[in-house]
Amino acid sequence: LVPHLGDREKRDSVCPQGKYIHPQNNSICCTKCHKGTYLYNDCPGPGQDTDCRECESGSFTASENHLRHCLSCSKCRKEMGQVEISSCTVDRDTVCGCRKNQYRHYWSENLFQCFNCSLCLNGTVHLSCQEKQNTVCTCHAGFFLRENECVSCSNCKKSLECTKLCLPQIENVKGTEDSGTT
């Protein structure tokens, strides 16, 4: 099976790497524009220069291209707690990230929110906080893990998953209650 190619890919594959086929004349291969620039005018003929112009402020191209316009720079989502790691340049988009002791939770492939790393109070750090993953905690005896926080077994209801972890405590509480009914 031959992989399906879009019109642009088909046209580009006729020319050597770093060149693209002239949109009005398929016998001409024009040199692509360098990153940080965009296509202003196609080359007039074989061996002649493509007219490439530098991206304006607030826009970029990160690879060689024959785009008619530069791409708009991304803006960091302050409402999601994001901070700017590096600002946009003509050849590189804005890089957004999180503050120290925070991790990214991805809502979708390109939308993330910053959350504080768990401190594992009443427990120990099993796996340290990573760029895209919260700390993994192990709880001390008498505590169980709920939403990555160590919660006292006194808050464990029989219907919850914590019953196995907190079984001795629950039995003790039950035993204490029973002993008062003589």
Epitope: H105, W107, S108, E109
Partner: nanobody, 117 residues
Framework: EVQLLESGGGLVQPGGSLRLSCAAS????????MGWVRQAPGKGLEWVSL????????YYADSVKGRFTISRDNSKNTLYLQMNSLRAEDTAVYYC??????????RGQGTLVTVSS
Amino acid sequence: EVQLLESGGGLVQPGGSLRLSCAASGFTFKGSNMGWVRQAPGKGLEWVSLIDGRGQHTYYADSVKGRFTISRDNSKNTLYLQMNSLRAEDTAVYYCAKPSVREFDYRGQGTLVTVSS
């Protein structure tokens, strides 16, 4: 095919409450991030609130923090938005949405919330 059906919108007085519901089908709801998006008259789409598959992570727009609560019932494939202390500026069409690469691609038909005296 992702299908999202909102209900619960209506006319409410300032300070009043509404609870929006969203019935989801056509995908694995349990493990999916979900949210509510709104579009006020003449404005763009904005995320109001988001919740992850297990309900551990949530997001609230600054304008609704402390007033709105997002929740989900994975056994019913349903997403909720409890809206309290409603204000005139909350008037908008509210959409149930599944975040995607193009942020607002997967959303329902919307339910109109009007806050007016």
